[in-house]
Amino acid sequence: MAPWPELGDAQPNPDKYLEGAAGQQPTAPDKSKETNKTDNTEAPVTKIELLPSYSTATLIDEPTEVDDPWNLPTLQDSGIKWSERDTKGKILCFFQGIGRLILLLGFLYFFVCSLDILSSAFQLVGGKMAGQFFSNSSIMSNPLLGLVIGVLVTVLVQSSSTSTSIVVSMVSSSLLTVRAAIPIIMGANIGTSITNTIVALMQVGDRSEFRRAFAGATVHDFFNWLSVLVLLPVEVATHYLEIITQLIVESFHFKNGEDAPDLLKVITKPFTKLIVQLDKKVISQIAMNDEKAKNKSLVKIWCKTFTNKTQINVTVPSTANCTSPSLCWTDGIQNWTMKNVTYKENIAKCQHIFVNFHLPDLAVGTILLILSLLVLCGCLIMIVKILGSVLKGQVATVIKKTINTDFPFPFAWLTGYLAILVGAGMTFIVQSSSVFTSALTPLIGIGVITIERAYPLTLGSNIGTTTTAILAALASPGNALRSSLQIALCHFFFNISGILLWYPIPFTRLPIRMAKGLGNISAKYRWFAVFYLIIFFFLIPLTVFGLSLAGWRVLVGVGVPVVFIIILVLCLRLLQSRCPRVLPKKLQNWNFLPLWMRSLKPWDAVVSKFTGCFQMRCCCCCRVCCRACCLLCDCPKCCRCSKCCEDLEEAQEGQDVPVKAPETFDNITISREAQGEVPASDSKTECTAL
């Protein structure tokens, strides 16, 4: 497969348009190299239709005039201005604003809780398997295997802190060296970025929103993957992370600190612990080859236990099995010895839904996975809707300017670094990079934050999660302090190295360009987002894992040709875009390859065949639910079915017409009506003041 889904001519062509969300779009300068192009064979067709006589706005736009899809949308304010309202209107508007704020905080709370439960669900479904990944002895000698184990385990348990704590306990008990642990930590860093990518998938309903959200989420993935791509070979060759962190750990006489403050958990834990509570020690025990742990359930049953350490007399086959010669005796028939036993007495059961069901972990995990994804999706939809209604006009302008504007010259370059600090600080407060980046995703989607601004915030989040780990390490007991601190520092310096690689010089901000490219592809072929997720977080790691188990020879035998092909394609791509003249005519574009190797169109047809039937059913269901909801809330005009259905109808009608952005309309109310956003009759009741 070629590296980009649509590969036409390499030369810039003003007549070619991007395959974007709203049909044909013009190529933006520079960005065209990153985005997908149409094939030579398919020329864009612009349809011009006559408009209804009442409209003075031109709905059909000339292809050349359409804005860059990455420009933030202007969230229009159709409401009455504050100054024009009477007292009653102002009071009503104030209370509406307060109500929206409460709702927003409520949905945000359940959004974070559902992320926590999603993590628990993943641990129940794949936690034991994740633990078994760690018990593989090849980790010690194969850094690539360590890396993919880090990715797989973190993806399976949906928590980098769980996977790193397993690594720490393994290093503390000498089952793993720090050197072998570093690739695992790098993998954990990659694995943790899946959460916000899943969250971005929830915004699949609106193409342009999804484009931004998915790109905003995957900028994290690309940063991590690219950092590993460069830093893992550097670490294997030089062991710089191991050496630096060892020097730091040895030069400081650290005293055991206090636990990192649990700020967000304090609020979410009372709710999440009513849903499910897990005994996370089980995964660590499996990782450390504890046979008994394999049969233990991850679902915590007893929350209050009394542990009593006693010495009991036990019979042994012979005196050779005695604890020590002095603790050995006979009763004349059997040999006895004294054994230290920890007697655990169960006092009180946990108070959560699954405590008395005695279901297998897989069943509980599956139930929670479905429920948490539904809640996550629901909360996300509501957050986006509320933010959409709040962030209009003046409010939106202020927020967008505050977040996305740079400092005045000559300090503009500092803005990004401040964003990194903000990201680190926010992550430290919420104690989870997944929560922070997942909360950021819908904001990128609705256009409050640009990807360029989200990037440093995400990098800061990566730093924030490592500072939390350092604090947690300082709170470790004596025997684990050194190893946990060194691993936390490795994680910290790995992220710092990554930032130094992919942030300071604008040219090196490859993750942004790659994420935008993927955003464009995923906006057109939305199934590709799921495909990307499966490939990058499951198939590639699992393939490397399988090949590594087969041995170095097999891994090199398969890996080297694959890497060679990738490098060859990348070089060819670079030459095609930079200096195509040096290439033979045939290689100046990808047309020499069959269509399925250079375009996603044939694949799209296959996927569409499979999903078409399901999509139709889904839309029918959606309409029924939607209408029922409208009847209940007594507003027959309020119902707009999901975007997926509209797109489906569009596809069936064969309308591939670029529509003007709302801000180009003369009559705002008409424009919003035309787009189906607001019923004309209800437009005057919109309240935007918060």
Partner: antibody, heavy 119, light 107 residues
Framework: QVQLVQSGAEVKKPGASVKVSCKAS????????MHWVRQAPGQGLEWMGA????????AYNQKFKGRVTMTRDTSTSTVYMELSSLRSEDTAVYYC????????????WGQGTLVTVSS | DIQLTQSPSFLSASVGDRVTITCKAS??????VAWYQQKPGKAPKLLIY???TRHSGVPSRFSGSGSGTEFTLTISSLQPEDFATYYC?????????FGQGTKLEIK
């Protein structure tokens, strides 16, 4: 209270066998080992072996192996010790003693049975 | 087999005296040692087990100490009924063995 009542004195000829009984009462018979210890006239104590009435498991002192057999009858809470191929040096007082659970100290002893071996 | 050697074999003492009897094992027996008292014509009676633990009903004047290979039985204040033969026994390994005994007589 715990009581161990042994059978009466026996006089045996060399080469013969002797079977001494020990009836236990006052405790759960099957939980404690029953040891047999002998004491030759004017000599010290010598452990012969033990039986666990619960399962019938036995352990003998190598010195007596092949000559001594310990059995039990749980219905009557009685333990038997049979010593075959008697010799004159087997003349001694034979004691049964109940062993404390889990270790080899003997907390309660029978009154003893004098076995005299003479031609 | 583990040998136990008691010393002295004979001991003369008066009522009220403090008496110490020692027992040496040929190898480490931990604390798996018991002490018995036997009066003429009677069965032995358990005094101490686990080297230091007094059996129920045994007067407090009897005490045991030691671990490994050296053990002692101490009678803090001799009473008339204490004149008897004392045996140490190990139950560290089979066969169980007894010391040769220490005869305590009235001076």
């Amino acid at each position: 209270q715990v009581q161990l009542v042994q059978s009466g004195a026996e006089v045996k000829k060399p080469g013969a066998s002797v079977k001494v009984s020990c009836k236990a009462s006052g405790y759960t018979f099957t939980t404690n080992n029953m040891h047999w210890v002998r004491q030759a006239p004017g000599q010290g104590l010598e452990w012969m072996g033990a039986i666990y009435p619960g399962s019938g498991a036995t352990a003998y002192n190598q010195k007596f192996k092949g000559r001594v057999t310990m059995t039990r009858d749980t219905s009557t809470s009685t333990v038997y010790m049979e010593l075959s191929s008697l010799r004159s040096e087997d003349t001694a007082v034979y004691y049964c003693a109940s062993g404390m659970y889990g270790h080899g100290a003997m907390d309660y002893w029978g009154q003893g049975t004098l076995v005299t071996v003479s031609s | 087999d583990i040998q136990l050697t008691q010393s002295p074999s004979f001991l003369s003492a008066s009522v009220g005296d403090r008496v110490t009897i020692t027992c040496k094992a040929s190898q480490d027996v931990g604390t798996a040692v018991a002490w018995y008292q036997q009066k003429p014509g009677k069965a032995p009676k358990l005094l101490i087990y686990w080297a230091t633990t007094r059996h129920s009903g045994v007067p407090s004047r009897f005490s045991g100490s030691g671990s490994g290979t050296e053990f002692t039985l101490t009678i803090s204040s001799l009473q008339p009924e204490d004149f008897a033969t004392y045996y140490c026994q190990q139950y560290s390994s089979n066969p169980l063995t007894f010391g040769q005994g220490t005869k305590l007589e009235i001076k």
